[in-house]
Each structure stands twice: as structure tokens, then as C-alpha cells.
């Protein structure tokens, strides 16, 4: 009986620790995508609608803020698309890129943690073009550090929640 009680307490402790594990999955806010052909910061993301969720992390001013030290898995998926109904591409040679950046407030500094993408030739003879980038990695993050996303050619972003998103989840504590 005592073993059973101990076991259930252990389960509860494990469960509450899991529930406290920080995570975030942020999806693009399609109503507020900036325009530009050079690298721009994407600051408008959903954190509480559709697939988007956040727990024990903070989303503020377009950045995902770490509240707990730890090792985190960070990921980003960015889709670019163009259909001829929206007009023509001003240039057919495109650099389609994503940059995942860490900013530290305590020691003012910024580092690109991950980047991905490609140069593309999107011919005007095609009705539709599509390109997807996925990056992911394991990083030591400290409380107060901020994660942000930059992309090239944001006017070509696919605005669907299953296409353009990024997130993080804590995997373990820092020993």
C-alpha cells in the first residue's frame, strides 16, 4: 500500500514537472506580414489560436523569451509561395532564407543560431511556385534570452499556420 502511495506521488511529481516544462509553438500572423525583399524581422506571431500554444515562456515584441535556464530544442519552418493571381515577380532570381537569432539583454549581443534556405529561379512561365525551409537544433538558453525569426522576401511567405511557424521546448536542465 505504501509503495502504491509512493508511486502515485512520484507520478504526480513527474507529471507536474512535465507540465512546468517550458514550450512554445508560434504561428505566423498573416494579417501583419511585413514587406521587403531584404532580410526583415518577423514580429507578429500567434501564441494562443489554432495550433499555436505557449507555456512557461513569454512572447513579447515579436520575440520568444526564455523564462527558465535549460537546454532547448528550437525549430522553425518557413514556406514561401507565389501564385500568378497575386501578380508577377519583379525578379525571377530569389534568395529565400530564414535566420533564427538569439539576443541576450544582460550582455547585449545577438547571434544567429540557425539559418537555412536557398537561391531559387522562379520562372515567370510557371503559374505556381513553392519552397519550404525547416531548421532545428539543440541550444543552451538562459532566462531572459530572446529568440526571433528573420526572413528574406516576406511578401512571399505562405501565411498558413501549418506552413510558417517556429517553436521551442525545454529538454533538460543545465547541470
Amino acid at each position: 500500500e505504501k509503495a502504491m502511495v509512493d508511486g502515485s506521488w512520484l507520478d504526480l511529481a513527474k507529471r507536474s514537472k512535465l507540465e512546468a516544462q517550458p514550450f512554445a509553438h508560434l504561428t505566423i500572423n498573416a494579417t501583419d506580414i511585413p514587406s521587403g525583399s531584404h532580410k526583415v524581422s518577423l514580429s507578429s506571431w500567434y501564441h494562443d489560436r489554432g495550433w499555436a500554444k505557449i507555456s512557461n515562456m513569454t512572447f513579447s515584441n515579436g520575440k520568444l523569451i526564455v523564462n527558465q535556464d535549460g537546454f532547448y530544442y528550437l525549430y522553425a519552418n518557413i514556406c514561401f509561395r507565389h501564385h500568378e493571381t497575386s501578380g508577377d515577380l519583379a525578379t525571377e532570381y530569389l534568395q529565400l532564407m530564414v535566420y533564427v537569432t538569439k539576443t541576450s539583454i544582460k550582455i547585449p549581443s545577438s547571434h544567429t543560431l540557425m539559418k537555412g534556405g536557398s537561391t531559387k529561379y522562379w520562372s515567370g512561365n510557371s503559374e505556381f511556385h513553392f519552397y519550404s525551409i525547416n531548421v532545428g537544433g539543440f541550444f543552451k538558453l538562459r532566462s531572459g534570452e530572446e529568440i526571433s525569426i528573420e526572413v528574406s522576401n516576406p511578401s512571399l511567405l505562405d501565411p498558413d499556420q501549418d506552413a510558417t511557424y517556429f517553436g521551442a521546448f525545454k529538454v533538460r536542465d543545465i547541470d
Epitope: 521587403g36 525583399s37 493571381t85 497575386s86 519583379a90 525571377e92
Partner: antibody, heavy 126, light 103 residues
Framework: QVQLVQSGAEVRKPGASVKVSCKAS????????IHWVRQAPGQRLEWMGW????????KFSQKFQGRITVTRDTAASTAYMELRSLRSEDTAVYYC???????????????????WGQGTLVTVSS | EIVMTQSPSSLSASVGDRVTITCRAS??????LNWYQLKPGKAPRLLIY???SLQSGVPSRFSGSGSGAEFTLTISSLQPEDIATYYC?????FGQGTKVEIK
């Protein structure tokens, strides 16, 4: 304020060429595209082609492919449209128009024309 | 190739009347539709872009609606200065125009 000022009326014989100019002022010429649109008597407006004033890229309607050339002089903030092998059906008012989305802000030529030239009447007659 | 079809081709209405012009696309064009006003001897004028956005400087009596393949331009209270031909447009394709006259 933004203005597009076109060259004056022209009369040409069939088989000849015509070159119409469109001088832009009041904005950064290189950051926008210029389209050419014409209207023949009693006809609908007809899109002919565009030029990205920044990089010189062009796109033309299949109908005019091979006999239209569109160029630009960024120093003079002027776009030019030359139409060759003229025929009587080319008698029309030719307009230049600015594409609204700024090329610095976006890469899509969206075909909405926020400013137009006053039009140039080209008459093709023997 | 997308074809734009406007109706009616002409209409006559009294000052103060509500006027509606319809534009149909041969296939879905989302909301990529613009409306222009043409007066003889004058430069064309952009009235509505993106199906329903009013271009700056255009009187609020002009409005646009629709999406997919069917769109309308409405003049809520026709004024003498609205006498013109109106064209819908999607990228490279224009409608055939609607001539608006005063009764």
C-alpha cells in the same frame, strides 16, 4: 506630388515605329515598376507590358511580344515604350502607369496602377 | 488566360441614385481586383484596389465588394462628376467597361 508626364501625340505610317516617353517625378523612380496600357477607339483597356525601373526586368503581353521594347533611364526618371511594325489597329491612346507596391518593400508587381500619365495618342495611317 | 466580364455595358441613372456595376472573372482571383474611372481626355484614376480598399483621395460614396469570381462597384449617391466609364481589372486583364450617364 507624384506625376507621370508623357510625350505628345504621334502620327505614323503602317510599318513604321513609335517611341513614347513617360517622365516620372515626385517619387523614387527606381523603387517602382512602370506599366504600359493602351486603349484603341471603342475598345477596352489593354495591358502591354511592364518594366521594373530598379533592375530593368521586363514582361510583355504575348500579343506584343517581338515588336515591343520597354526601356528606362534612371538618371532621367523616364520610361520608354517603343512599338515596331505599326498597323492601323495600333491606333490608340497609350498610357504609362505606376505600379503601387514599392519594390523596396516587396517583390511582387501587383498590377494596381495608382498614378497614370495623361496618355499619348498614336495614329497609324497611310 | 483570365477573362473579365462587366455588366451592364452602359447605364443611365439620376443624380443621387445608387449605382451598382458587376464584374465577373472566368476563374477565382481571390480579392485581386481593382476598379478604375476613365474620363475622356483625362488620365485614368484608381478607385478601389484589392476588391474593397478605397484608394486615398477617392470619395467615400465609392465602394467595392466581392471575392472569388464575382465583384461589385457601388456608387452610393451618383454625382454629376461621376459621369465616366468604369473598368474592373485583374493583373493583365480588364473588363470591357461600363459607361455611366446621367438621366
Amino acid at each position: 506630388q507624384v506625376q507621370l508626364v508623357q510625350s505628345g501625340a504621334e502620327v505614323r505610317k503602317p510599318g513604321a515605329s513609335v517611341k513614347v516617353s513617360c517622365k516620372a517625378s515626385g517619387y523614387d523612380f527606381s523603387n517602382y515598376a512602370i506599366h504600359w496600357v493602351r486603349q484603341a477607339p471603342g475598345q477596352r483597356l489593354e495591358w502591354m507590358g511592364w518594366i521594373n525601373a530598379g533592375n530593368g526586368n521586363t514582361k510583355f503581353s504575348q500579343k506584343f511580344q517581338g515588336r515591343i521594347t520597354v526601356t528606362r533611364d534612371t538618371a532621367a526618371s523616364t520610361a520608354y515604350m517603343e512599338l515596331r511594325s505599326l498597323r492601323s489597329e495600333d491606333t490608340a491612346v497609350y498610357y504609362c502607369a505606376r505600379d503601387s507596391p514599392n519594390m523596396v518593400r516587396g517583390i511582387i508587381i501587383a498590377y494596381y496602377f495608382d498614378y497614370w500619365g495623361q496618355g499619348t495618342l498614336v495614329t497609324v495611317s497611310s | 488566360e483570365i477573362v473579365m466580364t462587366q455588366s451592364p455595358s452602359s447605364l443611365s441613372a439620376s443624380v443621387g441614385d445608387r449605382v451598382t456595376i458587376t464584374c465577373r472573372a472566368s476563374q477565382s482571383i481571390s480579392r485581386y481586383l481593382n476598379w478604375y474611372q476613365l474620363k475622356p481626355g483625362k488620365a485614368p484614376r484608381l478607385l478601389i484596389y484589392g476588391a474593397s480598399s478605397l484608394q486615398s483621395g477617392v470619395p467615400s460614396r465609392f465602394s467595392g465588394s466581392g471575392s472569388g469570381a464575382e465583384f461589385t462597384l457601388t456608387i452610393s449617391s451618383l454625382q454629376p462628376e461621376d459621369i465616366a466609364t468604369y473598368y474592373c481589372q485583374h493583373t493583365r486583364a480588364f473588363g470591357q467597361g461600363t459607361k455611366v450617364e446621367i438621366k
